[in-house]
Amino acid sequence: STGSKQRSQNRSKTPKNQEALRMANVAENSSSDQRQACKKHELYVSFRDLGWQDWIIAPEGYAAYYCEGECAFPLNSYMNATNHAIVQTLVHFINPETVPKPCCAPTQLNAISVLYFDDSSNVILKKYRNMVVRACGCH
Amino acid sequence: STGSKQRSQNRSKTPKNQEALRMANVAENSSSDQRQACKKHELYVSFRDLGWQDWIIAPEGYAAYYCEGECAFPLNSYMNATNHAIVQTLVHFINPETVPKPCCAPTQLNAISVLYFDDSSNVILKKYRNMVVRACGCH
């Protein structure tokens, strides 16, 4: 149709930052400060600090890590953003009052094995899923 | 060992809120304001709003939804929290300077089908994954 042809021709008028954002083809050159960008940070959790030392036998603690940082427009590809996060970032960029920025959260988590006492004081070895952050991304 | 027995006997001295947090057994009675808790919110995104109307033919827009709200201690089970989020919430509760609270992010996302013009003005029908928030949780 003429409308379709018109729209097809109009595409060159679309702002570059939006054109580049064709769903998952995320702009590489982020304007947000790289030091502040969403990434994995060190965090060692001691079970004593959590007050769990009396029922967890081993380990004494573990490297849990955590995610923190900006998920600002435009998102870099290393930010493991979902298509929804890309759309939300753009909505926030257009009007920050409408939605918050996507948040920096774990995208991959690993398990740890824990030796602990159950309620009957039996010693149990159990694998706890999703305990360690392996990677972070914008969600 | 005597140490183990001692620790086993000491378990009753562990504060209730921490005992209840044995990994994924999350306390049901949240003290944080329910209205502010992490949940799914309405958000309709028109492709015109994003400036994409010249290359997206259909749909005109879609119900994207978004996640927003508090992930405060103790986490309710409906908050779909990972074990890591439970640990992070407790670390934050003990010392807010150490780590941020976990963030409210999509836990389930759905796809949508989009009819659009490619760079050669061909009409393409493509399924874009992770475009619609189906559920939110604390991560």
């Epitope: 909505v91 939605v99 | 309405e42 309709y44 028109s46």
Partner: nanobody
Framework: EVQLVESGGGLVQAGGSLRLSCAAS????????AGWFRQAPGKEREFVVA???????YYGDSVKGRFTISRDNGKNTVYLQMNSLKPEDTAVYYC???????????????WGQGTQVTVSS
Amino acid sequence: EVQLVESGGGLVQAGGSLRLSCAASGRTFSGYVAGWFRQAPGKEREFVVALSWSGITYYGDSVKGRFTISRDNGKNTVYLQMNSLKPEDTAVYYCGAGKGYYKDYRGYDYWGQGTQVTVSS
């Protein structure tokens, strides 16, 4: 919470103009879609016009070229300028704020109490 209060309704002759106002309190209006709907006796609530969070305007077919929506963020108020009014524009006009589908009243979370517009021939 957003509280909405409409004003500016009244009786006007066909071909005349009216300006409706919708003042928001409790929270800023600017992050929401601001929509005007109308309801004539015994009829469904009908979409009139919406101003998106992006600043883009969406008009219902029956009011295109006659009605204009605008927003004053400083005053936290949305206006509906109605020109070339027709008797069929007679209805209670409601202002809504939400983030759902702009043409569907179910996409709006907050509503005003409505203001009556009567167009006489």
